[in-house]
């Protein structure tokens, strides 16, 4: 090994990371020029842009699939980007139907072959862009890793690329003899990586002596609002849940200039920027007569893009609850129902690129995801108590009002690339 490569400045030729198997779509969904109808932002690699679009497609479909299996009163929060990145780690070693299903479920088959063959390189570039922001006012921390039983010998090339691109080698653990100890080790690693914000990602009894390979991906974001809410203006107000019940939420308030639009059927879309302007929170609030479930059903990347393109800066009054959502779940059954079957099957899985001896019995036993978001007057997951002097509540009847006192969707996105980093719904901000 020579000097360590900086993936963020590297060129594809600097890092030979061709996957063991490549995928070719039978009905060629993607062409080299696909996506050219939309203007690519300046200083943006076209392939990173493509990858970001694929992630948005996966984000909305996975969210809809997950939301269909949740109660309408449940909060949801996840990072589609983090999930895609984690499963791209397995794509590097996948072949046959296992590879095809990964390509289809994660929408990697909608991007050009050149991008998908080198997907790890472009994921690294995307992550460099997101995680190495020069602006120190926001912080994005993720912990993605594969953990495998120590009886396996892992492919050295796979290990090197995994470390270089995803920041972590596959870690061997003793699942057979020490399942509970292994679970504790994984949870401890995640907790350390996320500065104690995310704990217990793997629930008890989720690992046993039959566990072979476990995929873990966790992420948290901390950002300060560009325009903070004054704590003096926060009041207890009723929040009307989907089931018709109400609860008492801490409703923050501020007046200011924000990008906003009332779109189809009276749905309101509001964008709140974090300091640095590159990362924003988008809130989607249906009118009181329309259920959030209907908006979720109609949501597509195209609809979302259209709404974001229509936003215009204007003076408005924002009422928004303080909330904290922590959501963690196994991805296995959700993804199996979406068509990612073979990866989790001892009989069908084909992951020859991960192990050294060319064994063909390697499969992913389970995959866990956990993300959390806390929103308060300072921003997202901010505990500092900077003094903010902002005018109190005014009674301007002509001002446009955005009052999130009923269930709404929330997105955290990187603006230039329009990458959906997080998405979820706030159905009950009153839960502690």
């Amino acid at each position: 090994h020579g000097s360590p490569v900086d993936i963020c400045t590297a060129k594809p030729r600097d890092i030979p990371m061709n996957p063991m198997c490549i995928y070719r779509s039978p009905e060629k969904k993607a062409t080299e020029d696909e996506g050219s109808e939309q203007k690519i932002p300046e200083a943006t690699n076209r392939r990173v842009w493509e990858l970001s679009k694929a992630n948005s497609r996966f984000a909305t479909t996975f969210y809809q699939h997950l939301a269909d299996s949740k109660n309408d009163n449940d909060n949801i929060f996840l990072s589609p980007l983090s999930i895609s990145t984690a499963f791209a780690m397995t794509k590097l070693g996948a072949c046959n139907d296992t590879l095809q299903q990964l390509m289809e479920v994660f929408k990697f088959d909608t991007i050009s072959e050149k991008t998908s063959d080198q997907i790890h390189f472009f994921f690294a570039k995307l992550n460099c862009r997101l995680y190495r922001k020069a602006n120190k006012s926001s912080k994005l921390v993720s912990a993605n890793r594969l953990f495998g039983d120590k009886s396996l010998t892992f492919n050295e090339t796979y290990q090197d690329i995994s470390e270089l691109v995803y920041g972590a080698k596959l870690q061997p653990l003793d699942f057979k003899e020490n399942a509970e100890q292994s679970r504790a080790a994984i949870n401890k690693w995640v907790s350390n990586k996320t500065e104690g914000r995310i704990t217990d990602v793997i629930p008890s009894e989720a690992i046993n002596e039959l566990t072979v390979l476990v995929l873990v991906n966790t992420i948290y974001f901390k950002g300060l609002w560009k325009s903070k809410f004054s704590p003096e203006n926060t009041r207890k107000e009723l929040f009307y849940k989907a089931d018709g019940e109400s609860c008492s939420a801490s409703m923050m308030y501020q007046e200011g200039k924000f990008r906003y639009r009332r779109v189809a059927e009276g749905t309101q879309v509001l964008e709140l920027p974090f300091k640095g302007d590159d990362i924003t929170m988008v809130l989607i609030l249906p009118k009181p007569e329309k259920s959030l479930a209907k908006v979720e059903k109609e949501l597509t990347p195209e609809v979302l893009q259209e709404w974001l393109d229509e936003l215009e800066e204007m003076m408005l009054v924002v009422h928004m609850p303080r909330f904290r959502i922590e959501d963690g779940f196994s991805l296995k059954e959700q993804l199996q129902d979406m068509g990612l079957v073979d990866l989790f099957s001892p009989e069908k899985s084909k992951l020859p690129g991960i192990v050294a001896e060319g064994r063909d019995d390697l499969y992913v036993s389970d995959a866990f995801h956990k993300a959390f978001l806390e929103v308060n007057e300072e921003g997202s997951e901010a505990a500092a108590s900077t003094a903010v002097v902002i005018a109190g509540r005014s009674l301007n009847p002509n001002r446009v009002t955005f009052k999130a006192n009923r269930p709404f969707l929330v997105f955290i996105r990187e603006v230039p690339l329009n990458t959906i980093i997080f998405m979820g719904r706030v159905a009950n901000p009153c839960v502690k």
Partner: nanobody, 114 residues
Framework: QVQLQESGGGLVQPGGSLRLSCAAS????????WAWYRQAPGKQRELVAS???????NYADSVKGRFTISRDNAKNTVYLQMNSLKPEDTAVHYC????????WGQGTQVTVSS
């Protein structure tokens, strides 16, 4: 991939009844929201009724009071009880997820005619 198999359609006179069934192979069946849709010739597919994992139901205005959606989680099956059928209910009926739709099944033809 989730397989959907609809059955129970047929030819029925106006005012008659039918009970449609849909067997779904989803691992997450019991917690999942399911829906019945229909498509009449030359028309767009439309939502008829939906049921959440918790059992909350919703109906299109045109079928309210006549149709009832239900589920049996033990059998991974969703039902649509159709009463007081009208000629305008003639369509191919499909079941699928509510927000997320899997590959569509063959559907089951419902024809209401005297």
């Amino acid at each position: 991939q989730v397989q959907l198999q609809e059955s129970g359609g047929g030819l029925v006179q106006p005012g008659g009844s039918l009970r449609l069934s849909c067997a779904a192979s989803a691992l997450t069946f019991s917690s999942r929201a399911w829906a019945w849709y229909r498509q009449a010739p030359g028309k767009q597919r439309e939502l008829v009724a939906s049921i959440t994992g918790g059992g909350t139901t919703n109906y299109a205005d045109s079928v309210k009071g006549r149709f009832t959606i239900s589920r049996d989680n033990a059998k991974n099956t969703v039902y649509l009880q159709m009463n007081s059928l009208k000629p305008e209910d003639t369509a191919v009926h499909y079941c699928n997820g509510y927000r997320y739709t899997y590959a569509w099944g063959q559907g089951t033809q419902v024809t209401v005619s005297s």
